[in-house]
């Protein structure tokens, strides 16, 4: 189709080489009239459509994304050619940063319902550059945490080194929906609820004498509980003796509950005590069996191919540790009688 009638938007993604970050493009076609995907009169670049991204039909995935090759080849369907780019409804997600993402991206409705819809498309010229500015050492992260129940804030990474006074007007989106009131480079949240978790996008306009473009950054916001003040507790084994049959295989499970920690480095291991000797046993990898907002339960098993007489003289010790401290639980094997 002819893309010369598409409205054009220029975007800049300046990514940090130090961190993983994502990027999104919205198919920001204007809010349609009832039977059309687009208003006939296009919005001027300064106007913000009332609802972003495009909500032109009941099926929000009713848009098609293409990339325009720089060599003038025909448009390429994004889904077929670019595995690191995912279409989610009307949003295009770039999972990895890199200058190779630079280019022209076009979106338009899949279903052309009227002659007016033929030119109903948006062309986004995306320029991707690594961040070179070392002066802003402490720019906000693209992954930010909000502490549940307390006051928090979300900062726009590309503007976090500027004071509020010199910061340009910012347009914020949460999960693709325009946050109409927010215009500053930092969103303050009175009281954090899990509802505040999500993908936030901040846009501002930068201009030179020739043209203007939108600088965009994406922030993944996670809502968390405060770090635990407790060391982990062992849920299993509870008893310090275990009846076993000699010559039979045996699996002893150690299950421990670890409270939430922002920097989480749980330790769960088995070791054996035999008179004065002590050694760690190489056992299968630990696995998380339950994870909630507040805590995580991790399990690690010790497997004996067959229980020997010598095993009855040993103590099998499960050792668990977090940044607060450690806990142990020892198990003595006892031969089953009768």
């Amino acid at each position: 189709f002819n893309i010369s009638g598409c409205s054009t938007k220029k975007l800049l993604w300046t990514y940090s080489t130090r961190s993983e970050e994502e990027f999104v493009l919205f198919c920001d076609l204007p809010e349609p009239q009832k039977s059309h995907f687009c208003h006939r009169n296009r919005l001027s670049p300064k106007q913000v459509p009332e609802h972003l991204p495009f909500m032109g039909s009941n099926d929000l995935s009713d848009v098609q994304w293409y990339q325009q090759p720089s060599n003038g080849d025909p448009l390429e369907d994004i889904r077929k050619s670019y595995p690191h780019i995912i279409q989610d409804k009307c949003t295009l997600h770039f999972l990895t940063p890199g200058v190779n993402n630079s280019g022209s991206y076009i979106c338009r409705p899949k279903m052309i319902k009227s002659p007016y819809d033929v030119a109903c498309c948006v062309k986004m010229i995306l320029e991707v550059k690594p961040q070179t500015n070392a002066s802003c050492e402490y720019s906000a992260s693209h992954k930010q945490d909000l502490l549940l129940g307390s006051t928090g804030s979300i900062s726009c990474p590309s503007l976090s080194c500027q004071s509020d006074a010199q910061s340009p007007a910012v347009t914020w989106y949460k999960n693709g929906k325009l946050l109409s009131v927010e215009r500053s480079n930092r969103i303050v949240v009175d009281e954090v609820y899990d509802y505040h978790q999500g993908t936030y996008v901040c846009d501002y306009t930068q201009s030179d004498t020739v043209s203007s473009w939108t600088v965009r950054a994406v922030v993944q916001v996670r809502t968390i509980v405060g770090d635990t003040k407790l060391k982990p507790d062992i849920l299993d084994p509870v008893e310090d003796t275990l009846e076993v049959e000699l010559g039979k295989p045996l699996t002893i499970s150690c299950k421990a509950r670890f409270g939430f920690e922002r920097v989480f480095n749980p330790v769960i291991k088995w070791y054996i005590k035999d008179s004065d000797l002590e050694w760690e046993v190489s056992v299968p990898e630990a696995k998380s069996i339950k994870s909630t907002l507040k805590d995580e339960i991790i399990e690690r098993n010790i497997i004996l191919e067959k229980v020997t007489q010598r095993d009855l003289r040993r103590k099998f010790v499960c050792f668990v540790q977090n940044s607060i401290g450690n806990t142990t639980q020892s198990v003595q094997l006892k031969e089953k009688r009768g």
């Epitope: 549940l148 129940g149 307390s150 006051t151 979300i154 914020w172 949460k174 946050l179 009131v181 927010e182 969103i187 303050v188 949240v189 009175d190 009281e191 954090v192 609820y193 509802y195 505040h196």
Partner: antibody, heavy 119, light 111 residues
Framework: SLEESGGDLVKPGASLTLTCTAS?????????ICWVRQAPGKGLEWIAC????????TYYASWAKGRFTISKTSSTTVTLQMTSLTAADRATYFC?????????????WGPGTLVTVSS | DVVMTQTPASVSEPVGGTVTIKCQAS??????LAWYQQKPGQPPKLLIY???TLASGVPSRFKGSGSGTQFTLTISDLECADAATYYC?????????????FGGGTEVVVK
């Protein structure tokens, strides 16, 4: 507990200020203090909320913007200023406390104060 | 603003029976929904918050369910003391907005 005061009989076009007073806790803690009204024989209608924590943010139902103003006036009082009152504003006005511990729901209500608008 | 639509407006059931009240939100409010009971001349009383969590002291005969836009309050083994008006409320405190709209109410008559 919470207690509302300031309800009165006023003429159409008049202004009135209602006060919500806390006892047993203070608005220095972080709560959403809200005003809700109920016309005789009708349902509950949310008017506005103020966050009593550091941000001091205020929020209004779209119909209440401009004519109603919620403010925290001390560590134990929140007020609701109402202007250009009409017969449609006749209602019992409740002060209510919400917040994180109840998923934003109102766990504490005042008994209400009656506002009557009549010429 | 979020709009809450509550049905039915009134319901009558015998003692020991079951009442189901529905509440629909005009947009997705996840599980940020509360249910209140109000008796004449009294302020409302919180029954359920976060769609399904019972407030302290509320009997387990009251059950809340649902998420997104569709919510239900079920009162089983009806008692005379359950005769009241019940309201749902959106309790969403978002980024830069508060959505605290109430449903229109449901009057429960216990025969």
């Amino acid at each position: 507990s919470l207690e509302e005061s300031g309800g009165d009989l006023v003429k159409p076009g008049a202004s009135l200020t209602l006060t919500c007073t806390a006892s047993g806790f203070s608005f220095s803690s972080n709560y959403y203090i809200c005003w809700v009204r109920q016309a005789p024989g009708k349902g509950l209608e949310w008017i506005a909320c103020i966050y009593t924590g550091s941000t001091g943010s205020t929020y209004y139902a779209s119909w209440a913007k401009g004519r109603f103003t919620i403010s925290k006036t001390s560590s134990t009082t929140v007020t609701l200023q109402m202007t250009s009152l009409t017969a449609a504003d006749r209602a019992t006005y409740f002060c209510a406390r919400g917040g994180y511990s109840y998923g934003g729901a109102v766990s504490l209500w005042g008994p209400g104060t009656l506002v009557t608008v009549s010429s | 603003d979020v709009v809450m639509t509550q049905t039915p407006a009134s319901v009558s059931e015998p003692v020991g029976g079951t009442v189901t009240i529905k509440c629909q939100a005009s947009e997705d409010i996840e599980t940020y929904l509360a249910w209140y009971q109000q008796k004449p001349g009294q302020p409302p009383k919180l029954l359920i918050y976060r769609a399904s969590t019972l407030a302290s002291g509320v009997p387990s005969r009251f059950k809340g369910s649902g998420s997104g836009t569709q919510f239900t309050l079920t009162i089983s083994d009806l008692e005379c003391a359950d005769a009241a008006t019940y309201y749902c409320q959106c309790t969403l405190y978002g980024v830069n907005f508060v959505a605290n709209a109430f449903g229109g109410g449901t009057e429960v008559v216990v025969k």
